[in-house]
Interface confidence: low
């Protein structure tokens, strides 16, 4: 807390000029009114103040707007916004994507700090759903921020904004996030022919279930070994060994390195010996020949 | 320990120009901002450009805006004021000043004279 001192004679600020840089805290506090801060908050971040004394304008602006801060504002604090704590963001409404911007460019190259999440969240849920340009531009900034969303919170992304969605953004979504985009994914892209929609469902596909991995089979996709290894297990599981063939076209070779991991390792215990024989590449741990595979799970469902 | 060393200054007349350079060294961190500041006899310390080496925004107060122009060699490690339109109160003694961000400018060059005059 700033100690209250009179301003020294002659200090006091008429505008917000690189003339503060040289006061000390106390006379930033004396000296400089808090309306004027605020109508000229565009020229603080311009203005090599320290951190120290961004600490003393901050606390005039608190004091000034003890609900929260108005927009206009908020669009203008620059570093400012690097002071602010998460209580304080709860506090705004920010409404305009120029705003969001403004402040994300803050913190371009950093990690997403708790200040950052506050304000995204607060930004998000004043829009009530994600859109395409607030997708587009939150990526941008974050590639990862996607997969930090709740299913539920995924839930809300209407499948027009997926066209901004970017293969590393899906990096590190698990496979309960997939299964939202993934059909989001499938209404967005519907209307392209085979090749352009498989490069484009491609990051998406750890959410795609048995029948469309089938139908991708008849399409001659050639889906490398990276993408099939990311696949859901219990969708695999079903395909065929042709089918798998099919999906894999010249890639099938890499199934071989992959027999020990999941899906590879599961998927080669339901198939037949022989039919895993006449990919030729030595798989091994299939069913013998002779034996008969009984489907549990559906007699379950019959009984 | 980081040095920083000004040239280019000089006698120039009314209305002329100059450039004057800042070689940084014993840099860490391109997250530094840098600075031109300049003293005229009997007078307090005066910032005149501000650069970030980081995402190159500048700052100029009124007194020089559109006059003087701040730039930099991030590879180079160099810092340029270019100033045209010279007048008679820009005579000075010109600093370079390094900082880490938004704390205090807190490295100094030794100056460099700008007298302006016919």
């Known amino acids: 807390e700033v100690e209250k001192t009179a301003c020294p004679s002659g200090k006091k600020a008429r505008e917000i000029d690189e003339s503060l840089i040289f006061y000390k805290k106390w006379e930033l506090e004396a000296c400089v009114d808090a309306a004027l801060l605020a109508t000229q908050m565009d020229r603080v971040n311009a203005i090599p103040f320290t951190y120290e004394q961004l600490d003393v304008l901050k606390h005039k602006l608190d004091e000034l707007y003890p609900q929260g801060y108005p927009e206009s504002v908020i669009q203008h604090l620059g570093y400012l916004f690097l002071k602010m704590s998460p209580e304080d963001i709860r506090k705004w409404n920010v409404t305009s994507l120029e705003t969001l911007k403004a402040l994300l460019e803050v913190n371009k190259g950093h990690e997403m700090s708790p200040q950052v999440a506050t304000l995204i969240d607060r930004f998000v849920k004043g829009r009530g759903q994600l859109d395409k340009d607030t997708l587009d531009t939150l990526t941008a900034f974050y590639p990862g921020y996607l997969c930090s969303l709740s299913p539920e919170e995924l839930s809300s992304v209407p499948p027009s904004s997926i066209w901004a969605v970017r293969p590393q953004d899906l990096d590190t979504c698990d496979p309960r996030q997939l299964d939202v985009l993934y059909p989001k994914a499938r209404l967005a892209f519907q209307n392209m022919n085979g090749s352009e929609y498989f490069v484009k469902i491609q990051s998406f596909l750890g959410g795609a279930p048995t029948e469309d991995l089938k139908a991708l089979s008849q399409q001659n996709v050639s889906m490398d070994l990276a993408t099939f290894m990311k696949l859901r297990t219990d969708a695999v599981l079903p395909l065929t060994v042709a089918e798998v063939q099919k999906l894999l076209g010249p890639h099938v070779e890499g199934l071989k390195a992959e027999e020990r991991h999941r899906p590879v390792r599961d998927w080669i215990l339901r198939q037949r010996q022989d039919d895993l024989d006449t990919l030729g590449l030595g798989l091994q741990g299939g069913i013998p020949n002779g034996y008969l595979v009984l489907d549990l799970s559906m007699q379950e469902a019959l009984s | 320990e980081v040095q920083l060393v000004e040239s280019g200054g000089g006698l120039v007349q009314p209305g002329g120009s100059l450039r004057l350079s800042c070689a940084a060294s014993?840099?860490?961190?391109?997250?530094?901002?840098m600075g031109w500041f300049r003293q005229a006899p009997g007078k307090g310390r005066e910032l005149v450009a501000s650069i970030n080496s980081f995402d190159s925004i500048t700052y100029y107060p009124d007194s020089v805006e559109g006059r003087f122009t701040i730039s930099r060699d991030n590879a180079k490690r160099m810092v340029y004021l270019q100033m045209n339109s010279l007048r008679a109160e820009d005579t000075a003694v010109y600093y370079c000043a390094a900082r880490l961000v938004r704390q205090a400018f807190n490295y100094w060059g030794q100056g460099t004279q700008v007298t302006v005059s016919s």
């Open positions: 014993g840099f860490i961190s391109n997250f530094y901002s």
